[in-house]
């Protein structure tokens, strides 16, 4: 029977900068029941606080609700593991909520085949940012990535769309049914999950184009 091994806070995520959750990985348990507590202080303060909510994020987590979440302030946090034989502490983790946002996927992905009379046909797609993200304040810049593939293909073709919420692709295989998805990430932060797949049938008379894709 031994004191517990050193825990590690390995992940923190926020859906929208208004709340966030951090997760830790326990060390060895030393063969005894172990209690974990997360304590933190905000940069520039000395007052230590305990995790306000150990439940919402699931096992080995700490959830910070709206009233505990401050942007532009670094949180300095650590986890203490204690059993009957002693204690061990994680390394301190410095967290700025601005940098840990993982948004929901973009919404309302629509995909159309456009066949203008005077130009080559192309695939046109547009989408909306996730609803929880407030782009109007300027706090967020969202970047987008698109992927598509023929239904039976193994490999995805990926395009970076920058900050645009619409995109054209000029080179596709006629007669194929394509899956299209989009995801987003803040300029500092993490990629969302991919949006649900949208399917589009490319007409058999779709003319292949030399140019691959182009941005609006």
């Amino acid at each position: 029977q031994l004191p517990p091994g050193k825990p590690e806070i390995f992940k923190c995520r926020s859906p929208n900068k208004e709340t966030f959750t951090c997760w830790w990985r326990p060390g060895t348990d030393g063969g005894l029941p172990t209690n974990y507590s997360l304590t933190y202080h905000r940069e520039g303060e000395t007052l230590m606080h305990e995790c306000p909510d150990y439940i919402t994020g699931g096992p080995n987590s700490c959830h910070f609700g709206k009233q505990y979440t401050s942007m532009w302030r670094t949180y300095v946090m650590m986890v203490n593991a204690t059993n009957q034989m002693g204690s061990s502490f994680s390394d301190e983790l410095y967290v700025d909520v601005t940098y840990i946002v993982q948004p929901d996927p973009p919404l309302e992905l629509t995909v159309e085949v456009k066949q203008p009379e005077d130009r080559k046909p192309y695939l046109w797609m547009k989408w909306s940012p996730p609803t929880l993200i407030d782009l109007k304040t300027g706090w967020f810049t969202l970047l987008y990535e698109i992927r598509l593939k023929p239904e039976k293909a193994a490999e995805w073709e990926t395009h970076f769309a920058g900050q645009q919420t619409e995109f054209k692709i000029l080179s596709l295989h006629p007669g194929q049914k394509y899956l299209v998805q989009v995801r987003c990430k803040p300029d500092h932060g993490y990629w969302s999950a991919w949006s649900p797949a949208t399917f589009i049938q490319i007409p058999s008379d779709f003319i292949m184009n030399d140019h691959h894709h182009h941005h609006h």
């Epitope: 590690e8 390995f10 992940k11 923190c12 990985r25 940069e43 520039g44 670094t74 390394d91 983790l93 410095y94 967290v95 700025d96 601005t98 940098y99 840990i100 990430k185 993490y190 990629w191």
Partner: antibody
Framework: QVQLQQPGAELVMPGSSVKLSCKAS????????MHWVKQRPGQGLEWIGE????????NYNQKFKDKATLTVDKSSSTAYMQLSSLTSEDSAVYYC?????????????WGQGTLVTVSA | DIVMTQSQKFMSTTVGDRVSITCKAS??????VAWYQQKPGQSPKLLIY???NRYTGVPDRFTDSGSGTDFTLTISNLQSEDLADYFC?????????FGGGTKLEIK
């Protein structure tokens, strides 16, 4: 404890490429961004770029955009920087440095640096 | 790019002195400044982040003051082990940039 292990030195020919490694241990590799910094003998520090090991997303200093390529191998917790078309100007010590936290780019852990010498 | 200027390349000092190393940003960087110490043959070591916060384990004789464009790292009661190069760094906007360094030497 946190360690970033880099080879001590690389001697390379002008015009060739070199791939520098930085093996991380003592923490979860995918949690923190990794940065690369150049230091020429007796000179200051220049930031080359950064990579998020969780998804390989990277940002570069425009000055090094055509010179450096950053990659990671999650399975071995190793970050790499490939330098191409080497000239004497690329002779320097190259450091990998781990982001201080989940936040802005200050660097709390540094490798010992790899001295790259470009010489025929 | 934001230029970080450390106008004193060298400073002659004595053990026990109070030393102030200055760093000036070419544009506003708020408090997004870090300071590093580098001894010969070693990699840099973080001292201060966010302009005024000492990193874990850094002695309290190291302090920083300033925000906006002008920053000062002060070492009070200088110890012989403090003789090193000191670099400031801004992380307000890409690309992150460093000052040219200030070397502390014994008089």
């Amino acid at each position: 404890q946190v360690q970033l292990q880099q080879p001590g030195a690389e001697l390379v020919m002008p015009g060739s490429s070199v791939k520098l490694s930085c093996k991380a241990s003592g923490y979860t590799f995918t949690t923190y961004w990794m940065h690369w910094v150049k230091q020429r003998p007796g000179q200051g520090l220049e930031w080359i770029g950064e990579i998020d090991p969780s998804d390989s997303y990277s940002n570069y200093n425009q000055k090094f955009k055509d010179k450096a390529t950053l990659t990671v191998d999650k399975s071995s917790s190793t970050a790499y920087m490939q330098l191409s078309s080497l000239t004497s100007e690329d002779s320097a010590v190259y450091y990998c440095a781990r982001n201080g936290g989940l936040g802005p780019a200050w660097f709390s852990y540094w490798g010992q640096g790899t001295l790259v010498t470009v010489s025929a | 790019d934001i230029v970080m200027t450390q106008s004193q390349k060298f400073m002659s000092t004595t053990v026990g002195d109070r030393v102030s190393i200055t760093c000036k940003a070419s544009q506003y960087v708020g408090t997004a400044v870090a300071w590093y110490q580098q001894k010969p043959g070693q990699s840099p070591k973080l001292l201060i982040y966010s302009a005024s916060n000492r990193y874990t384990g850094v002695p309290d004789r190291f302090t920083d003051s300033g925000s906006g464009t002008d920053f000062t790292l002060t070492i009070s009661n200088l110890q012989s082990e403090d003789l090193a190069d000191y670099f400031c760094q801004q992380y307000s906007s890409y690309p992150w940039t460093f000052g040219g360094g200030t070397k502390l030497e014994i008089k």
